[in-house]
Interface confidence: medium
């Protein structure tokens, strides 16, 4: 009789259902009714992560670092090497195939999220009485300038890009 | 009816040689694993040798390298080929007929009558 | 090689009444949500025949009044109402690690 359904950790082989291999291992043979699945373990720089019948293991992945890569995590058996960019740089994909640059908020804007290893910068605009005269992947917008408390009047207003200018009241003349 | 018939069981002496023979009629004997277990004379029951339908075999490390099992699916006939004997495979052997639902699932689902072997000098 | 102790080594049950026979494995027979365990049933110049495979399945033919329940290490098979044909021996046996093997067996009397 051929068995009808196989467990979770099986596959069906003709009339049998044979035991998948675990993880860190691949196929060599399929199981027999005398003779278990034949199992080996991954070489050095190969993995598989799941119950499987492979009869290959992956690869472990490169990090290159041409491409701004850098290793995260070793990979292990049944585990894939992890990759994460450089300082400075972020992954252009959600794969993290390869790094750039992390952006720079231009005069005008400021960093409303300081970069990581794999997003970019996240910047905004200066909403009013907030300004940013750099470029700058760190730079938050900064309050303009209150006269006032420093007992100065206010001479220039402020921008986006630019703050105000304070100077002594001038007093008139008689 | 499914009929499995052993014969070939005789006194032998140590280190003698003997071939055991399972005539089997009933059941499409191609399609199914067959196995030999046997019982000792202190009735405790041993797994001794498999077959596969597709010709593999399996035999526990106490019969290793001394004992071959082997099937003629055209005559319906399974065998045990026994060499350098001892005193300890002393037992009445029986061809049996496993079922396996998946590798590790095997039944043995029809029995022969068994076939004694003596070891002894 | 995993090691079935069977117990007791023998019992005698009134006619109508419930047999119990127990078999512990050296380790798990368990595997992927399956027990690998069978029970045969031996009468005195015959060949072993099979009442349960897989733990708790009834081997087609057999009557129900033979019951196998456990998992894992512990296995149990019942006979429930005994009868005069039930004397025999019974034995456990594990598929699910080569060698397969067999527990010692289990003589059952009828008073």
């Known amino acids: 009789e051929p068995a009808t359904a196989c467990g979770e950790k099986q596959y069906p082989v003709n009339s049998l259902c044979c035991d998948l291999c675990p993880p860190g291992q691949k196929l060599v043979n399929d199981c027999t009714e005398v003779s278990k699945t034949e199992c080996q373990s991954c070489g050095k720089g190969e993995f598989l992560s799941t119950w499987n019948r492979e009869k290959y293991c992956h690869e472990h992945r490169y990090c290159n670092p041409n491409l701004g890569l850098r290793i995260q995590s070793e990979g292990t058996l049944n585990t894939d090497t992890t990759c994460v960019c450089v300082e400075g740089q972020h992954c252009t994909s959600h794969t993290c195939e390869s790094c750039t640059p992390h952006s720079l908020c231009l005069p005008g804007f400021g960093v409303k999220q300081i970069a990581t290893g794999l997003l970019d910068t996240v910047c905004e605009p200066c909403p009013l009485g907030f300004f940013s005269n750099v470029s700058s992947a760190f730079e938050k917008c900064h309050r303009w300038t209150s006269c006032e408390r420093k007992g100065l009047v206010e001479q220039h207003v402020g921008t986006n890009k630019t703050d105000v200018v304070c100077g002594f009241q001038s007093r008139m003349r008689t | 009816e499914v009929k499995l018939v052993e014969s070939g069981g005789v006194l032998v002496k140590p280190g003698g040689s003997l071939k055991l023979s399972c005539a089997a009629s009933?059941?499409?004997?191609?399609?199914?694993?067959m196995s030999w277990v046997r019982q000792t004379p202190e009735k405790r029951l041993e797994w001794v040798a498999s077959?596969?339908?597709?010709?593999?075999?399996y035999y526990p490390d106490s019969v290793k390298g001394r004992f071959t099992i082997s099937r003629n699916n055209a005559r319906n006939i399974l065998y045990l080929q026994m060499s350098s004997l001892r005193s300890e495979d002393t037992a009445m052997y029986y061809c049996a007929r496993a079922y396996y639902r998946n590798h590790r699932g095997s039944v043995m689902d029809y029995w022969g009558q068994g076939t004694s072997v003596t070891v002894s000098s | 090689d995993i090691v079935l102790t069977q117990s007791p080594a023998s019992l005698a049950v009134s006619l109508g009444q419930r047999a119990t026979i127990s078999c512990k494995a050296s380790q798990t027979v368990d595997y992927d949500g399956d027990s690998y365990m069978n029970w045969y049933q031996q009468k005195p110049g015959q060949p072993p025949k099979v009442l349960i495979y897989?733990?708790?399945n009834l081997e087609s033919g057999i009557p129900a009044r033979f019951s196998g329940s456990g998992s894992g290490t512990d296995f149990t098979l019942n006979i429930h109402p005994v009868e005069e044909e039930d004397a025999a021996t019974y034995y456990c046996?594990?598929?699910?690690?080569?060698?397969?093997?067999f527990g010692g067996g289990t003589k059952l009397e009828i008073k």
């Open positions: 009933g059941f499409t004997f191609s399609s199914y694993a």
């Open positions: 046996q594990q598929s699910t690690e080569d060698p397969p093997t």
């Open positions: 077959i596969g339908s597709g010709g593999g075999t």
């Open positions: 897989s733990a708790s």
